[in-house]
């Protein structure tokens, strides 16, 4: 009997009221393997999930959040509200990120700039609340001992400093 | 990869204005943010200006702030450096940089910073 089941397509389930009959996933069900006993239900894509993937015999819905919410979570299991870049959500809703750190994103956390002094590199441009700093050449390089009459060749290789 | 060419240097009267221009090529959408830096004779690179190619925002030295301008055309991909109300400490070798990523980041056998190869400018009257 066992057989019988395990020849149950996808989009079908194994009904032990008709002898094991394969028959169709009602309405709103799915099953995606074979052999099941029965279909799963369709996930509602509600409220502020949206759908992306209709529902079919064979296959699970799939949801997206709408228009100001991005997903959490595997397969979209959560939607949580964006806030503008240069923000980050906290209990209190969207706040400005704190000086001396970014978020480049509609989601996440402000995270610090990042220190060029670290990584021995000089600064370039600033950072802002929307963008980390973006570093230069290293001091060194822009040192009076590191000079030279010589302006550098233009063929040389990229990646090295005028000295 | 990235080249850069300078353009636009010389011999110039105080008081008067001058227009750098340094033309990028190659693998130019790897450009996140471009500078001008500047070296006088007997002394250390000094950093003039520099602009995020994306939006434009732009820093300034203190020393040219008021009288110099840095600009961008990303369609020609050229930035621009104008110098006005120029001063004999501004004679210098104006190079131009170029910056691949944000912070100090970089990918692993990929440059991340280029450098053209200077153009003189020379304040005198």
């Known amino acids: 009997l066992q057989d019988l089941c395990s020849n149950c397509p996808a989009g079908t389930f194994c009904d032990n009221n008709r002898s094991q009959i394969c028959s169709p996933c009602p309405p709103n069900s799915f099953s995606s393997a074979g052999g099941q006993r029965t279909c799963d239900i369709c996930r509602q894509c509600k409220g502020v999930f949206k759908t992306r993937k209709e529902c079919s015999s064979t296959s699970n819905a799939e949801c997206d959040c709408i228009s100001g919410y991005h997903c959490l979570g595997a397969e979209c299991s959560m939607c949580e509200q964006d806030c503008k870049q240069g923000q980050e959500l906290t209990k209190k809703g969207c706040k400005d990120c704190c000086f001396g750190t970014f978020n480049d994103q509609k989601r996440g956390i402000c995270r610090p700039w990042t220190n060029c002094s670290l990584d021995g590199k000089s600064v370039l441009v600033n950072g802002t609340k929307e963008r980390d700093v973006v570093c230069g050449p290293s001091p060194a390089d822009l040192s009076p001992g590191a000079s030279s009459a010589t302006p550098p060749a233009p063929a040389r290789e990229p990646g090295h400093s005028p000295q | 990869q990235v080249q850069l060419v300078e353009s636009g240097g010389g011999v110039v009267q105080p008081g008067r204005s001058l227009r750098l221009s340094c033309a990028a090529s190659?693998?130019?959408?790897?450009?996140?943010?471009m500078g001008w830096y500047r070296q006088a004779p007997g002394k250390g690179l000094e950093l003039v200006a520099s602009i995020i190619t994306g939006d434009g925002d732009t820093n300034y030295a203190d020393s040219v702030k008021g009288r110099f301008t840095i600009s961008r055309d990303n369609s020609k991909n050229t930035m621009y450096l104008q110098m006005n109300s120029l001063r004999a400490e501004d004679t210098a070798v104006y190079y131009c940089y170029a910056r691949t990523g944000y912070g100090s980041s970089w990918l692993m056998g990929h440059e991340y910073d280029y450098w053209g190869q200077g153009t003189q400018v020379t304040v005198s009257s």
């Open positions: 190659g693998s130019t959408f790897s450009i996140v943010a």
